[in-house]
């Protein structure tokens, strides 16, 4: 499945929106920094399977959508930027949805893909628990925003690689 060029553009637009959403200086939140353990191995360019990567991208965007769709998130960010962010994520989900279905139909996921989806889910579990533990403070949200930007940047680079491999 060829991820359309629009998907890569959408990913970049989502990154720009995430950057614009920042309200606090990252430096004022250094004490709240946390290593969420982004599951880089899932997206390892040397060994990943295409179907696995696409499934993991989808899970990552779906979990990001859910994370930023909460009441606590709505209170933390500018409503207009958040709405634009939702639209970009929704479009990416649609692109990936078509790709996931095309890549493997609706057959059960191979063991490798199971583990990749679980790794992404656990990563977002850590983010969720971190936010709850910090009582959704502005600095906690800033740390999470920066973290999601990093993971999006990583996946954007990988998607370019995916297209080159085609």
């Amino acid at each position: 499945c060829d991820l359309p060029q629009t998907h890569s553009l959408g990913n970049r637009r989502a990154l720009i929106l995430l950057a614009q959403m920042g309200r606090i200086s990252h430096f004022s939140c250094l004490k709240d920094r946390y290593d969420f353990g982004f599951p880089q191995e899932v997206f390892d360019g040397n060994q990943f399977q295409k179907a696995q990567a696409i499934s993991a991208f989808h899970e990552m965007i779906q979990q990001t959508f859910n994370l930023f769709s909460t009441k606590d998130s709505s209170a933390a960010w500018d409503e207009t930027l958040l709405d634009k962010f939702y639209i970009e994520l929704f479009q990416q989900l649609n692109d990936l949805e078509a790709c996931v279905t095309q890549e493997v139909g609706v057959e059960e996921i191979a063991l490798m893909n199971e583990d990749s989806i679980l790794a992404v889910r656990k990563y977002f579990q850590r983010i969720t628990l971190y936010l709850m533990g910090k009582k959704y403070s502005p600095c906690a949200w800033e740390v999470v925003r920066a973290e999601i930007m990093r993971s999006f940047s990583f996946s954007t680079n990988l998607q370019k690689g995916l297209r080159r491999k085609d």
Partner: antibody
Amino acid sequence: QVQLVQSGAEVKKPGASVKVSCKASGYTFRNYWMHWVRQAPGQGLEWMGEINPSHGRTIYAQKFQGRVTMTRDTSTSTVYMELSSLRSEDTAVYYCARGGLGPAWFAYWGQGTLVTVSS
Amino acid sequence: EIVLTQSPATLSLSPGERATLSCSAGSSVDSSELYWYQQKPGQAPRLLIYSTSNLASGIPARFSGSGSGTDFTLTISSLEPEDFAVYYCHQWSSYPFTFGQGTKLEIK
């Protein structure tokens, strides 16, 4: 509020198939994996598998591989669990439960569907 | 498959007493993915504790959870009549997700 409403009780003969439905409301259906858990009379809970309603991908417990099929209909926000080649030990209450993260994991359950397999 | 073994199978106590329920995993479980559920006859399970030690919404403070690795505990500090039920531990740390066989908490 989140609600999961399941189809009614079924009585089936050994060797037959059963299809249980779970209609979701109160949230964005496509955004959360849906799981199926069963409970035989007087027994514990057993995870059967899950489906992502967005693209229909499934992950099944090895025990049910080849016998279970989970599907979804996004137009009606409904997921289905079909179990084939039924045997008496499949007599159980079948639950759908919504995935999520943190306090949302299996925080929402259907009311359960009793499937009785008897000749 | 991670096997979760709960003990005791049945616990007979009186209201006001302290209850300690154990859950032992066959291999290590990430504490973030260890949950506890309560089930009463004829009802679906109800989430009690998520991520080992966090109380779910609406759950009274008499419930608490602890543990790490392979050993986890659910404690009810002072039993109320409505606490008598079956309790299950559950892990989603690795596939297939599993539940313990349950501990039945009954009135002595």
